[in-house]
Interface confidence: low
């Protein structure tokens, strides 16, 4: 047994460009806390897989408010170590996940809100009893500096915390065959209580006569690497080539129970009896309890009174996830109608409506033309949340107050000259062209291309554009 200890030294912007904005502000003060998750072995595992070696939450750090205009500094940290107790042997190799969480202390209805700022992960080898190891990890633009160590809890000693030490019974020396427990020279190794022949390197025991194996070793004396464990099986015929007994279909072969669980065969298959702090069909889940405060955002923790039992978080409205850690994106349901902008304020949804619409969900279409007058005989047309005037001939602008210059857009093609007229515009076409906008060339034989000139108008005559 022992304790894994993690000391966070700093959390702040990493080197290089793209410094992150401070996670806190005058409007939204916040504080940080950390979560560590440990797993045995060097396997690449998803962040969601069980923390089989254990997990711990830090205390909350000091409240921090960003100074306007200042770059994000190293943020104030919680006091103390994160400690993850381990009950069995220290595995020597482990994976870790360290999460930095932000607790927002603004005007939150229903308590503070949490969000994950950064997550770093790594795989390390570490002997128990050794010095602090220092590490730097980066997550996006953030940098986390920390140290860690594994130490054994008395009376355990050794790189795996599997040897036991006891105070000396005699003042001068230890008993026959027992060495002093360095560095505690006043203590001696406890008498060997494990099963006779149990491998001192790969086996350990917690009770007399027991021989429990470290990861990667198996057999009654923990002397067989897992890859060759089939030679131990008592079932099946002997293999002529290897001299091994070929294993039969034993449900407990290879011990499917993780984390030191013991396997017993049942009529259907097998059942795992899990050590304290682990559960799951194969003892694969570690025991975080309600006392660890695993439910975020005001979630109610049910069950989990001790590490042998699970907990479940019942989340308040607006949050979801097994730890209520995820804010439901209520804006994804597009509650704001008529093009309104959705704002999720945490305690409430707010819709910012486009012009011409109102109501909690922008559901009311205002009368755009109410109180609006269009000048000079223009008529008001509703549409799209804004009024529009359809102006009488010769007038333009938003309210038809501007006298339109029909020639401003240069409507006469092929060099035709434009004249403003009380009812519109008139194009005087250049030789060889005709039409209301001088758009049609006149053929050399005198016939027009299309359409035919109206009676009474010769090609080249100015045509009034009605």
């Amino acid at each position: 047994a022992g304790v894994f200890e993690l000391q966070i030294h700093s959390f702040g912007p990493g080197p290089g460009p793209g410094a992150p904005r401070s996670p806190c502000s005058a409007r939204l003060p916040c504080r940080l806390f950390f979560r560590v998750c440990l797993k045995p072995g060097l396997s690449e595992e998803a962040a969601e897989s069980p923390c089989a070696l254990g997990a711990a939450l830090s205390a909350r750090g000091p409240v921090y408010t960003e100074q306007p205009g200042a770059p994000a500094p190293d943020l104030p940290l919680p006091d103390g170590l994160l400690q993850v107790p381990f009950r069995d042997a220290w595995p020597g190799t482990f994976s870790f996940i360290i999460e930095t969480w932000r607790e927002e202390l603004g005007d939150q209805i229903g308590g503070p809100a949490w969000s994950l700022l950064a997550r770093v992960a790594g795989r390390r080898r570490l002997a128990a009893g050794g010095p602090w190891a220092r590490d730097i990890q980066r997550a996006g633009a953030w940098e986390l500096r920390f140290s860690y160590r594994a130490r054994c809890e008395p009376p355990a000693v050794g790189t795996a915390c599997t040897r036991l030490c006891r105070p000396r019974s005699a003042p001068s020396r230890c008993g026959p065959g027992l060495r002093p427990c360095a560095p505690l020279e006043d203590e001696c190794e406890a008498p060997l209580v494990c099963r006779a022949g149990c491998s001192p390197e790969h086996g350990f025991c917690e009770q007399p006569g027991e021989c429990r194996c470290l990861e990667g070793w198996t057999g009654p004396l923990c002397t067989v690497p897992v890859s060759t464990s089939s030679c131990l099986s008592p079932r099946g015929p002997s293999s002529a080539t290897t001299g091994c007994l070929v294993p039969g279909p034993g449900p407990c072969d290879g011990n499917p129970c993780a984390n030191g669980g013991s396997c017993s065969e049942t009529p259907r298959s097998f059942e795992c009896t899990c050590p304290r702090g682990f559960y799951g069909l194969r003892c694969e889940v570690s025991g975080v309890t309600c006392a660890d405060g695993p439910c975020f955002n005001g979630g109610l923790c049910v069950g989990g009174a001790d590490p042998d039992s699970a907990y479940i978080c019942h989340c308040p409205p607006g949050f979801q996830g097994s730890n209520c850690e995820k804010r439901v994106d209520r804006c994804s349901l597009q509650p704001c109608r008529n093009g309104g902008l959705c704002l999720d304020l945490g305690h409430a949804l707010r819709c910012r409506c486009r012009a011409g619409f109102a109501g909690p969900r922008c559901e009311h279409d205002l009368d755009d033309c109410a109180g609006r007058a269009c000048a000079n005989g223009g008529t008001c047309v509703e549409g799209g949340g804004a009024h529009r005037c359809s102006c009488a001939l010769g007038f333009g602008g938003r309210d038809c107050r501007e006298r339109a210059d029909p020639c401003a857009a240069r409507p006469c093609a092929h060099g035709g000259r434009c004249y403003a007229h009380f009812s519109g515009l008139v194009c005087a076409c250049a030789p060889g062209y005709m039409g209301a906008r001088c758009e049609f060339p006149v053929h050399p034989d005198g016939a027009s291309a299309l359409p035919a000139a109206p009676p009474g108008l010769r090609p080249g005559d100015p045509q009034r554009y009605l």
């Epitope: 969601e48 479940i312 979801q320 996830g321």
Partner: antibody, heavy 118, light 108 residues
Framework: QVQLQESGPGLVKPSQTLSLTCTVS??????YYWSWIRQPPGKGLEWI?????????NYNPSLKSRVTISLDTSKNQFSLKLSSVTAADTAKYYC????????????WDQGTLVTVSS | EIVMTQSPGTLSLSPGERATLSCRAS???????LAWYQQKPGQAPRLLIY???SRATDIPDRFSGSGSGTDFTLTISRLEPEDFAVYYC?????????FGQGTKVEIK
């Protein structure tokens, strides 16, 4: 090997209270969640509620006002009471263990058909 | 509550064929807190898969689960005669615990 065995009447009159008991053998009732699920004839499964070994309960909101689940650790039993029953409560009622690690129903009994009829 | 919708309602296949059953949640089921059960006529449901992809004790490896978020799948790689049954998915992420309406796998 964990086994669950239900007991209780198969016929209940409308407006009365349905009572069922589930006895756990081959293992302790401690450290697990114990649940009731029902299945109307020809239909799907509906979770009724669970009780944790320390007595904490959680019920389906649709039935919450009528359901009580209790536990007797000395007898390794847990019980369901459903009050003010109607014909819509006619179903096969199952007791099951929720595995605390996987939070899924890993052991079930064979179920008891309860008919609500006068 | 999270509503679980299974499709198809009925799947008609022959022994030896591959069966793919779908389960969709009305909102994200975090950490894959989803289980699959098999139920035969007159019997209680039997746990097949938990955690979206972990096989329960004594379940043959022809059964596999996958998916995350809102979309989950149960695959039976080669149907055996004893696999013809009704299959239910169940989420245990958010209370209340809810089941899908079931998919019946029948012999073609």
């Amino acid at each position: 090997q964990v086994q669950l065995q239900e007991s209780g009447p198969g016929l209940v009159k409308p407006s009365q209270t349905l009572s069922l008991t589930c006895t756990v053998s081959g293992g302790s009732i401690s450290s697990y969640y114990w649940s009731w699920i029902r299945q109307p004839p020809g239909k799907g499964l509906e979770w009724i509620g669970y009780i944790f070994y320390n007595g904490i309960t959680n019920y389906n909101p649709s039935l919450k006002s009528r359901v009580t689940i209790s536990l007797d650790t000395s007898k390794n039993q847990f019980s369901l009471k459903l009050s003010s029953v109607t014909a819509a409560d006619t179903a096969k009622y199952y007791c099951a263990r929720i595995h605390s690690g996987s939070f899924s129903f890993d052991y079930w009994d064979q179920g008891t058909l309860v008919t609500v009829s006068s | 509550e999270i509503v679980m919708t299974q499709s198809p309602g009925t799947l008609s296949l022959s022994p030896g064929e591959r069966a793919t059953l779908s389960c969709r949640a009305s909102q994200s089921v975090s950490r894959g807190y989803l289980a699959w059960y098999q139920q035969k006529p007159g019997q209680a449901p039997r746990l097949l898969i938990y955690g979206a992809s972990s096989r329960a004790t004594d379940i043959p490896d022809r059964f596999s689960g996958s998916g995350s978020g809102t979309d989950f799948t149960l695959t039976i790689s080669r149907l055996e005669p004893e696999d013809f049954a009704v299959y239910y998915c169940q989420q245990y992420d958010t209370s209340p615990i809810t089941f899908g309406q079931g998919t019946k796998v029948e012999i073609k």
